[in-house]
């Protein structure tokens, strides 16, 4: 028998990825980071 239509049995949690760059003053370049769910990971 074919299966009746149902959604997947698990919930997908979407997280916002935020790229940012912070100027730390002249001659010192910049800090580039990746924030995932509020935590800086890079």
């Amino acid at each position: 028998d074919a299966e009746f239509r149902h959604d997947s049995g698990y919930e997908v949690h979407h997280q916002k990825l935020v790229f940012f760059a912070e100027d730390v003053g002249s001659n010192k370049g910049a800090i580039i980071g990746l924030m995932v769910g509020g935590v800086v990971i890079a």
């Epitope: 028998d1 074919a2 299966e3 009746f4 239509r5 149902h6 959604d7 997947s8 049995g9 698990y10």
Partner: antibody
Framework: QVTLKESGPALVKPTQTLTLTCTLS??????????VGWIRQPPGKALEWLAH???????SYNPSLKSRLTISKDTSKNQVVLTMTNMDPVDTATYYC???????????????WGQGTTVTVSS | DVVMTQSPLSLPVTPGEPASISCRSS???????????LEWYLQKPGQSPQLLIY???NRFSGVPDRFSGSGSGTDFTLKISRVEAEDVGVYYC?????????FGQGTKLEIK
């Protein structure tokens, strides 16, 4: 509040085509995940599932009756229509429509039913 | 088709006493998504069916907690911890994992 109401002829003759309408209120069939199905119950007997239609026009039929059934929807009228061809006295039953909604935050069960409409097939 | 077999077909119960209804499927009704779509409905006299339990053990909103569902694979049970007069009617199990959706033949609960 959510309601479903079935309408159609109370009496049809053998070999004729039955057309039943389910009018929905309190929710929209155009809502993602929404679906409406038809179930029937012969006098004194158990329930039998007939067909189901989804918001995206996907349809599912009981294979034993598929050749006789057509389910469709009119989103503008918020109605679902079931037609059954070549009616026979054994098709005498109360016909119900019921709501079912897909989704991880939905019940995904027949949570609201109409009051049913009784159809007698006789010459 | 998946055949749903209920027992007993008739269930006389004294108010305040527990009641149990069995529903067995002819094959597994575990969906490929990991859920088991087994539902219980009550049809009170002269009324449309009403949802009690979905996905084996989840009580629908407004359903008293004296109703509980359990089971897995092919063997399922609806239990009423203390039967009340308003619980009379016909109880149906329904599997919605496979097409066609199939109901049990019904269990008529009556008050002794």
């Amino acid at each position: 509040q959510v309601t479903l109401k079935e309408s159609g002829p109370a009496l049809v003759k053998p070999t004729q085509t039955l057309t039943l309408t389910c009018t929905l209120s309190g929710f929209s069939l155009s809502t993602s995940g929404m679906g409406v199905g038809w179930i029937r119950q012969p006098p004194g007997k158990a329930l039998e599932w007939l067909a189901h239609i989804w918001w995206d026009d996907d349809k599912s039929y009981n294979p034993s009756l598929k050749s006789r059934l057509t389910i469709s929807k009119d989103t503008s009228k918020n109605q679902v229509v079931l037609t059954m061809t070549n009616m026979d006295p054994v098709d005498t039953a109360t016909y119900y429509c019921a709501r079912r909604q897909l989704g991880l935050r939905s019940i995904d069960a027949m949570d609201y039913w109409g009051q049913g409409t009784t159809v007698t097939v006789s010459s | 088709d998946v055949v749903m077999t209920q027992s007993p077909l008739s269930l006389p119960v004294t108010p305040g006493e527990p009641a149990s209804i069995s529903c067995r499927s002819s094959q597994s009704i575990l969906h490929s998504n990991g859920n088991t779509y087994l539902e219980w409905y009550l049809q009170k006299p002269g009324q449309s069916p009403q949802l009690l339990i979905y996905k084996v053990s989840n009580r629908f909103s407004g359903v008293p907690d004296r109703f509980s569902g359990s089971g897995s694979g092919t063997d399922f049970t609806l239990k009423i911890s203390r039967v009340e007069a308003e619980d009379v009617g016909v109880y149906y199990c329904l599997q919605t994992t496979r097409v066609p959706l199939t109901f049990g033949q019904g269990t008529k609960l009556e008050i002794k």
